[in-house]
Interface confidence: low
């Protein structure tokens, strides 16, 4: 025998108190799949969270963060304070990048400047707190006619040699 609850569509629940008929989800609740015996409570976007998408009978609300903060985690479960470029967030608040490091975003951490000499290049443009250095041609290439400029190496990804 087929479970009568399997006929209940998303946005409803199978109400055991009413002979397993399909009842609409109550206000501020939802069911995103059919055959549910309960509806889930809608997420409420309060405080530093703001509503990006309202809850409906078939889908949960989605939150993002108020200006000055950005989302962290799956489904924006946390909001973290923005910093300025050239800074990183610590428990003591936003802190300027130390000399030799930079951060070109409002989030994340300060990263070391590219070491141009590792690739046999020279520094074409010095780094700042907000920008990486720009590596230029190797000193030996600095001869008439040599004009190519190499962009900075991309940030290291896992799987490459450790720092």
């Amino acid at each position: 025998l087929q479970d009568p609850c399997s006929n209940c569509p998303a946005g409803t629940f199978c109400d055991n108190n009413r002979n397993q008929i399909c009842s609409p989800c109550p206000p501020n609740s939802f069911s995103s799949a059919g055959g549910q015996r309960t509806c889930d409570i809608c997420r409420q976007c309060k405080g530093v969270f703001r509503t990006r998408k309202e809850c409906s009978s078939t889908s949960n609300a989605e939150c993002d963060c108020t200006p000055g903060f950005h989302c962290l985690g799956a489904g924006c479960s946390m909001c973290e304070q923005d910093c300025k470029q050239g800074q990183e967030l610590t428990k003591k608040g936003c802190k300027d990048c130390c000399f030799g490091t930079f951060n070109d975003q409002k989030r994340g951490i300060c990263r070391p400047w590219t070491n141009c000499s590792l690739d046999g290049k020279s520094v074409l443009v010095n780094g700042t707190k907000e920008r990486d250095v720009v590596c230029g041609p190797s000193p030996a290439d600095l001869s008439p006619g040599a004009s190519s400029v190499t962009p900075p190496a991309p940030a290291r990804e896992p799987g490459h040699s450790p720092q």
């Epitope: 946390m78 610590t90 428990k91 975003q105 989030r107 994340g108 951490i109 940030a155 290291r156 990804e157």
Partner: nanobody
């Protein structure tokens, strides 16, 4: 210089447990949120968990929620990942990372520790 050294990986049977550690140095560990990521063979990088600087806030990828626990000991400059009810799909190289970045380029990474779940 920031250094992160993961350990604790190995071969474990499905349903088993492992505890990964990440020893941090070169920065004030207790001032920063920390994260775990993983990379399965032939796959892209996947965020696993994040922990606030004081350990009061955690968040997990849906794929590990209820099975993995991220924690830290600021007095030992060490981050942990307790992995329970391991599945074959948890097989990956696990990396700890300074900062709470979710799949953002340019984080500080360790060298990783391999976790293999197989019978």
């Amino acid at each position: 210089e920031v250094q992160l050294l993961e350990s604790g990986g190995g071969l474990v049977q499905p349903g088993g447990s492992l505890r990964l550690s990440c020893a941090a140095s070169g920065f004030t560990f207790g001032d920063y949120a920390m994260s775990w990521f993983r990379q399965a063979p032939g796959k892209g990088l996947e965020w696993v968990a994040v922990l606030s600087y004081d350990g009061s806030n955690t968040d997990y990828a849906d794929s590990v929620k209820g099975r993995f626990t991220i924690s830290r000991d600021n007095s030992k400059n060490t981050l942990y990942l307790q992995m329970n009810s391991l599945r074959a799909e948890d097989t990956a190289v696990y990396y700890c990372a300074k900062g709470p970045l979710i799949l953002a380029a340019g984080n500080y990474w360790g060298q990783g520790t391999l976790v293999t779940v197989s019978s």
